[in-house]
């Protein structure tokens, strides 16, 4: 047998060489077309396992879009035809709760999760006899990477004199549940940086195949939480990085989500974008925002893909994406996942399993309506999956998809065998579909969530609610004391109330100046490299949030450290959630908060509010009877009609759907 090259096994402490045996038909020599289903016999540690594989239909589509750039920096859009892709998922015969994510493109490569061990398999280089290396994932050498600063590092920091023991915490009741009842769909967009592209020999096809493989691995990990990963886009920075990647992980993450909001969202709708970087951050494997998966401005993460295998890298991306999905680190909590360490452990452990805590954190996100964007099954033109009736994704050419024949028995509107609507059905799913019929125009389908949001209504001829819009960023709110920012009125009192209860309010400005000038974990203007930044006096109102009149202590499933600083006759309260430096701190002042006359917080600096590009003269444009929405169209008050609120009508905008139903005035909001 061929011996593996040093490069191939240098990261393994133990491995075996095996020859998988294909059960279904003779092993093909030609790489395409790939079978929809295939089975192999695989040997591992003296045992033979029969594995059954099925092409992962939910993963990728007809119009898989890949964005690249030419030498002039012009965006190129490509739709490579990869319907008959070679990425599979499956199970090990006779092994309860087993799962497999493999590609069968040029030999078998991927992950096998058995009851108490995970194995990696890959083709043996230069073998002409279909030989493969199989190894336990525990036997892969890994650099001691962490998701930012580990919790222990934070605890080691010098205790502050002012720090107080918080009042006793109410323990949240824990319900152990591995799988949440309703399937959620994460529409994932991956961006690959220039250095990683160069590292892959500037081979766009190789990058694309590797990222599809990664998405397949992610899907195999998330399925235990009843979450499906659907890759909706890939962008490769072939001509140079489009953001500044100099600085700390926090700086790069901030730059990336700003670029995403400005350039990527408009091109391709998605729930979370993950940047894949070659450059490391001194032991930090990645960084992401917590609970922001549906946010326009913060649904992103960065992930370091250096000299590690894609199998190991998958657990890093699963971890950072987990943060977006509301999952905190497992460290210091009573969590179990049936393995030595779990995916949301702060040290990048290469684990494949989510813990009970992760399931609970994600459930909390969904209960708090933070995961509403995950309910939609990706539309046919948005999902990169080879169309297949029965995968519960409405693919191109399908009108509905109710899943398996058993599931379809419960669906009155969809013909399971054809994925077409039954003849009497107008629709089968969607916020504006009820009992197989379109809800009447004027039915509220997405209510107003704050004074900076606007409602949306069904239009009477579609199963979908109108796209979500809100009041244009920069519009005054809270009696001119604040500005609207991404659908929320951002002001200090409200932020204090979220953390410290309904009686709390912002502390005086002196508190912010005194605490945030210190540059420690309780008072800072962000994180750069390995240290906290002190706030200049002019930026102090954009650092750590300072509150007073605190009567409740927060419980977010993770016990925070609370600091109380006496200042000029009051007590300033601040909080550190100790989430690790791979997670932006929810105890900081929110972006978009008004920090002075005509000024807002951005990137922990108090800058001119003109950066919000608010350009709506409501008197001229909306005749004083409405406001501009995020599409820069008038949303009229009840009594006035769009588009310009000039004539009598029933309110709303060209974007909101009709606010009124002639037949049924009870539908008015």
């Amino acid at each position: 047998a061929a011996r593996p090259g040093f490069q191939q096994t240098s990261h393994l402490s133990s491995y075996e060489i095996i020859t998988p045996w294909r059960l279904t038909r003779e092993r093909r020599e030609a790489p395409r077309p790939y079978s929809k289903q295939v089975s192999y016999v695989i040997q591992a540690e003296g045992k033979e396992h029969i594995i059954h594989l099925e092409r992962n239909k939910d993963l990728l589509p007809e119009d898989f879009v890949v964005y690249t750039y030419n030498k002039e920096g012009t965006l190129i859009t490509d739709h490579p035809n990869i319907q008959n892709h070679c990425h599979y998922r499956g199970y090990v015969e006779g092994v309860h709760n087993s799962s497999i994510a493999l590609s069968d493109c040029f030999g078998l490569r991927g992950l096998l999760h058995l009851e108490n061990a995970s194995y990696g398999i890959e083709p043996l280089q230069n073998s002409s006899h279909f030989e493969h290396i199989i190894y336990r994932m525990d036997d892969v050498y890994k650099e001691p990477l962490k998701c930012g600063v580990s919790n222990k590092d934070i605890e080691k920091e010098t205790a502050k004199d002012e720090e107080e023991e918080p009042p006793s915490m109410t323990q949240l009741l824990r319900r152990r549940r591995a799988v949440l009842p309703q399937t959620r769909y994460v529409e994932l967009f991956i961006v690959v940086d220039k250095e990683r592209y160069d590292m892959m020999g500037r081979n766009q096809t190789a990058v694309r195949e590797e990222m599809i493989l990664l998405a397949n691995y992610l899907d195999s990990m998330y399925i235990m939480l009843n979450i499906r990963i659907v890759l909706v886009g890939l962008e490769i920075w072939t001509n140079g990085n489009l953001i500044n990647i100099v600085g700390g992980a926090g700086d790069v993450l901030g730059n990336f989500v700003q670029w995403r909001e400005k350039f990527l969202i408009t091109r391709r709708r998605h729930d979370s974008a993950q940047l894949v970087l070659k450059k490391g951050f001194g032991g930090t494997a990645g960084m992401a925002f917590v609970g922001t998966v549906c946010s326009r401005s913060h649904a992103g993460g960065i992930n370091v893909f250096g000299q590690i295998t894609v199998e190991t890298f998958a657990s890093i991306v699963a971890h950072e994406l987990g943060h977006n999905l509301g999952m905190n680190h497992d460290d210091g909590r009573d969590c179990s996942c049936g393995a030595k360490s779990c995916i949301m452990n702060s040290g990048a452990s290469g684990s494949r399993n989510f813990s009970s805590c992760s399931a609970e954190d994600f459930e909390k996100l969904t209960l708090n309506k933070g995961g509403n964007c995950l309910l939609n099954i990706p539309k046919p033109d948005e999902a990169y999956s080879a169309p297949s009736c029965g995968n519960k994704l409405v693919d191109a050419g399908e009108e509905c998809d109710c899943g398996t024949p058993k599931e379809c028995e419960l669906d009155p509107c969809c013909e399971g065998s054809t994925c077409k609507l039954k003849s009497f059905a107008e629709c089968a799913y969607g916020d504006c579909c009820k009992d197989c019929r379109f809800l009447p125009g004027g039915t509220l389908c997405r209510g107003k969530t704050s004074e900076c949001d606007v409602p949306e209504y069904c239009n009477g001829s579609s199963q979908f609610c109108q796209p979500d819009v809100f009041i244009q960023n920069g519009y005054p709110c809270q009696n001119n004391k604040a500005y609207c920012y991404n659908g929320m009125c951002q002001y200090y009192d409200a932020q204090c109330q979220v953390i410290f209860g309904s009686k709390a309010k912002a502390a005086p400005k002196d508190c912010f100046i005194e605490v945030n000038s210190k540059g420690d974990r309780f008072g800072n203007c962000g994180f750069s490299g390995n240290e906290y930044k002190k706030c200049a006096t002019g930026n102090a109102l954009c650092g750590k949030l300072q509150c007073e009149n605190v009567q409740e202590i927060p419980v977010f499933g993770i016990v925070p450290a609370i600091i109380q600083t006496p200042s000029r006759g009051t007590k300033c309260w601040g909080v550190d959630f100790q989430l690790g430096s791979d997670v932006p701190d929810p105890g900081m002042v929110n972006e978009g908060t008004k920090c002075g006359a005509g000024k807002i917080c951005r990137n922990f600096q108090c800058v001119d509010a003109s950066v919000l590009n608010y350009d709506c003269d409501v008197q001229k444009k909306c005749h004083g009877h409405g406001v501009c929405n995020s599409n820069k169209n008038c949303h009229c008050e009840n009594g006035w009609a769009p588009p310009n609120c000039e004539t009598k009508g029933y309110g709303g905008s060209v974007d909101s759907g009709p606010t009124y139903n002639e037949m049924n005035t009870a539908l008015r909001d």
């Epitope: 009155p412 003849s423 009497f424 107008e426 629709c427 089968a428 001829s461």
Partner: nanobody
Framework: EVQLVESGGGLVQAGISLKLSCTAS????????MGWFRQAPGKEREFVAG????????AYTDSVKGRFTISRDNAKNTVYLQMNDVKPEDTAVWYC?????????????????WGQGTQVTVSS
């Protein structure tokens, strides 16, 4: 090839009842959805009521709910529209249509077969 023939129309006074019939011939209507449409002079054809051939599913436009009832008799290959308390605005040519595909009830292109129509005139 399925043929649909409407009957039961005519000149009636407001407030009385009327029953329209639609009889199908030339094919089986299993899994079809049968719809009644009206087209008033100078207006677009609009969906009024529908019934599934093989289930109890019925649908009505809001303006006729509680006033009209759609039913079917599979043995006679016929669909009925019972119109109570007719109003002058019900004056129109009434059409029967059949479709095998799902989608919006007012998407006329989804219907495979149409009858010739029957005139209903309601005088006040």
């Amino acid at each position: 090839e399925v043929q649909l023939v409407e009957s039961g129309g005519g000149l009636v006074q407001a407030g009385i009842s009327l029953k329209l019939s639609c009889t199908a011939s030339g094919g089986t209507l299993t899994n079809y959805f049968m719809g009644w449409f009206r087209q008033a002079p100078g207006k677009e054809r609009e969906f009024v009521a529908g019934v599934a051939w093989s289930s109890d599913f019925t649908a009505y436009t809001d303006s006729v709910k509680g006033r009209f009832t759609i039913s079917r008799d599979n043995a006679k290959n016929t669909v009925y529209l019972q119109m109570n308390d007719v109003k002058p605005e019900d004056t129109a040519v009434w059409y029967c249509a059949a479709r095998r595909r799902g989608g919006g009830y007012n998407q006329l292109n989804l219907y495979d077969y149409w009858g010739q129509g029957t005139q209903v005139t309601v005088s006040s």
